[in-house]
Amino acid sequence: HTAAQDNCTCPTNKMTVCSPDGPGGRCQCRALGSGMAVDCSTLTSKCLLLKARMSAPKNARTLVRPSEHALVDNDGLYDPDCDPEGRFKARQCNQTSVCWCVNSVGVRRTDKGDLSLRCDELVRTHHILIDLRHRPTAGAFNHSDLDAELRRLFRERYRLHPKFVAAVHYEQPTIQIELRQNTSQKAAGDVDIGDAAYYFERDIKGESLFQGRGGLDLRVRGEPLQVERTLIYYLDEIPPKFSMKRLTA
């Protein structure tokens, strides 16, 4: 009887039900809401996490200017349809038969329509810009220290390959993290930038998805990095298709 056997839990996803009924009595975990088996050595897909969340009881300028095609997730939470791999289905519909197309991070990229709406493919979000404002500190963070710590955070906590963290920009108090991952770059087993960004967003909001009651403890040279505002922009490999009516509203 070892300490590890006491811990049939999912380190990377607290929104799971786990039991030692896997092969050889190994711990196996299933996501709430979907019942899909998850790999607890890596991040769970955003689609399965959103589904689990909806099933839970209700409680010189160096900064980047987001492109005109950048999407912000203004629609909030919804109960998504996920494919057998846990990815978002290209078309999402609500209970009133209103449908829309989404990108690989589940953000709407077309006007809403009816059941006749077609979404031919799941368009990949290949560039994510995370825009943060940190709380006041005694002085600015050292840019290279901040850069190194954020890259380490994404590598160690979110298991994202370092090559997908394209840049870290800093103009006190604004921090921008650029994640880039083309379809051709993403190998089997690589964490998706959309999933890493979602875990990071939840961490910053104090809603850690990792096991236990703890939360993110992020420091730069021992100084806590506390974020007071977050904006995330999503850029797709194919620009979104919205009507002019929406753009001028």
Epitope: A3, D6, R157, R213, G214
Partner: nanobody
Framework: QVQLQESGGGSVQAGGSLRLSCVDS????????MGWFRRAPGKEREGVSV????????YYADSVKDRFTISRDNAKNTVYLQMNSLKPEDTAMYYC??????????????????WGQGTQVTVSS
């Protein structure tokens, strides 16, 4: 795969001292909360002590306060538990544990994701 390896257990007379060590062979050691837990025969697992990544925060179970001291050496990827004034009721298997990187942790075992195999501590009267 993270490997936590404890050492330093053994048998000692009541009032004696032992120093437990735990080496973390993983590359994420310096950003993980580390803890010591124990299980006495026929009892539930109990949190003993926890230390933050920079060593600036420590937590102790009431039963070991002022007798046990946790510390860490990030250059050696090692966490220590200095146990003084040992009592027979400290007899247990002692386990080292590590949190997920950058995740805060308390004396709750649920906050820890990686565990060592344990080292036996026996205190006789």
């Amino acid at each position: 795969q993270v490997q936590l390896q404890e050492s330093g257990g053994g048998s000692v007379q009541a009032g004696g001292s032992l120093r437990l060590s735990c080496v973390d062979s993983g590359s994420t050691y310096s950003r993980r909360y580390m803890g010591w837990f124990r299980r006495a025969p026929g009892k539930e697992r109990e949190g003993v002590s926890v230390i933050s990544p920079y060593g600036d925060s420590t937590y102790y179970a009431d039963s070991v306060k002022d007798r046990f001291t946790i510390s860490r050496d990030n250059a050696k990827n090692t966490v220590y538990l200095q146990m003084n004034s040992l009592k027979p009721e400290d007899t247990a298997m002692y386990y080292c544990a590590a949190s997920w990187p950058y995740q805060t942790a308390s004396l709750d075992a649920m906050d820890f994701t990686d565990w060592g195999q344990g080292t036996q501590v026996t205190v006789s009267s």
